[in-house]
């Protein structure tokens, strides 16, 4: 499955939108920084079969979509930007779902992939727990926004490596 060029453009657009969503100066939030233990190894395309990498990407985008689709998220961000961001993520999910179906037919996805997906889910659980502990404060959301920008950048790099493998 070849991810369309529009997919990586969508990812870049999502990153730009997320960058524009900030409501307060991040300079006031240094003390709120937190180690979410991003599972960097899951974004290393070299150790994966293509089907596995696509599944990890799908999980990453799905969890990001879920995080920004909550009521708490709606209260935190400017509505029109949030809607545009969610639309970009939804389009990416559609692209990836088509690829997952196609690739899983070609390669048998080993158990190792389940571990990778679980690692991504646990990462997002840590983010959600942090937001709950910080009572969804503006600074907590700023920290999470910065963290998601970072993980989306990792996703973009993984997509680039996947295209080079084709």
């Amino acid at each position: 499955c070849d991810l369309p060029q529009t997919h990586s453009l969508g990812n870049r657009r999502a990153l730009i939108l997320l960058g524009q969503m900030g409501r307060i100066s991040p300079f006031s939030c240094l003390k709120d920084r937190h180690d979410f233990r991003i599972p960097q190894e899951e974004f290393d395309g070299n150790q994966f079969q293509k089907a596995q990498a696509i599944s990890v990407l799908h999980e990453m985008i799905q969890q990001t979509f879920n995080l920004f689709s909550t009521e708490d998220s709606s209260a935190a961000w400017e509505q029109s930007l949030l809607e545009k961001f969610s639309t970009e993520l939804y389009q990416q999910l559609n692209d990836l779902e088509a690829c997952v179906i196609q690739e899983v037919g070609v390669e048998e996805t080993p158990l190792m992939n389940e571990d990778s997906i679980l690692a991504v889910r646990k990462y997002f659980q840590r983010i959600t727990l942090y937001l709950i502990e910080r009572k969804y404060s503006p600074c907590a959301w700023e920290v999470v926004r910065a963290e998601i920008m970072r993980s989306l950048s990792f996703s973009t790099n993984l997509q680039k490596r996947l295209r080079r493998k084709d």
Epitope: G22, P26, F36, R150
Partner: antibody, heavy 121, light 107 residues
Framework: EVQLVQSGAEVKKPGESLKISCKGS????????IGWVRQMPGKGLEWMGI????????AYSPSFQGQVTISADKSISTAYLQWSSLKASDTAMYYC??????????????WGQGTLVTVSS | DIQMTQSPSSLSASVGDRVTITCRAS??????LNWYQQKPGKAPKLLIY???SLQSGVPSRFSGSGSGTDFTLTISSLQPEDFATYYC?????????FGQGTKVEIK
């Protein structure tokens, strides 16, 4: 390879203006903040201020607020430190350094080589 | 502003010595503390971040500890290239502040 390359040494007279630069390469320039640090001759490190190149938001140390201006041009991955009217006491080495912003990553992990500014009549 | 106080301001030691530098913050900074090494005519170099994390490429003889207000940088066995000035820096809030520095000299 991550690099911060600063502009060359400057010799100026009191009252003159000056703008020094710091060009980032080997990483996504807008994903990190750029801080400026002063070191006067034989003295320690003093944090002056910082900029987020993604939106040019700035924060200054109270000691330097109104004395200098920090700016950035993300299209050329460059941050700037400028003075409108230099004083002899501005004579120092000025360093730029990369900061991860709100991400859990090392602070000031890469530094420029420094720009020596000499202000003398 | 948060004041950072280092001690001693200078020390003399021999190659192979265990060296300890302390840094005290005027208020709690949790673990938001970094240590830098600076050699004459060179830019500072990050050694330790978040109080105890060793920066990539830094020799394991360097270690950091502490939280709250009291922090320590330890060099387990001083090497010739370690003679330099060391600075602590708090990163919990603006304005970011550095300690005044500790110069490690050859005995």
């Amino acid at each position: 390879e991550v690099q911060l390359v600063q502009s060359g040494a400057e010799v100026k007279k009191p009252g003159e203006s000056l703008k020094i630069s710091c060009k980032g390469s080997g990483y996504s320039f807008t994903s990190y903040w750029i801080g400026w640090v002063r070191q006067m001759p034989g003295k320690g490190l003093e944090w002056m201020g910082i900029i987020d190149p993604s939106d040019s938001d700035t924060a200054y140390s109270p000691s330097f607020q109104g004395q200098v201006t920090i700016s950035a041009d993300k299209s050329i991955s460059t941050a700037y430190l400028q003075w409108s009217s230099l004083k002899a006491s501005d004579t120092a080495m000025y360093y730029c350094a990369r900061h991860p912003g709100l991400n859990w990553a090392p602070d000031f992990d890469y530094w420029g080589q420094g720009t020596l500014v000499t202000v003398s009549s | 502003d948060i004041q950072m106080t280092q001690s001693p301001s200078s020390l003399s030691a021999s190659v192979g010595d265990r060296v300890t530098i302390t840094c005290r913050a005027s208020q709690s900074i949790a673990e938001f503390l970094n240590w830098y090494q600076q050699k004459p005519g060179k830019a500072p170099k990050l050694l330790i971040y978040f109080a105890s994390s060793l920066q990539s490429g830094v020799p394991s003889r360097f270690s950091g500890s502490g939280s709250g207000t009291d922090f320590t940088l330890t060099i387990s066995s001083l090497q010739p290239e370690d003679f330099a000035t060391y600075y602590c820096q708090q990163s919990i809030d603006f304005p970011l502040t550095f300690g005044q520095g500790t110069k490690v000299e050859i005995k």
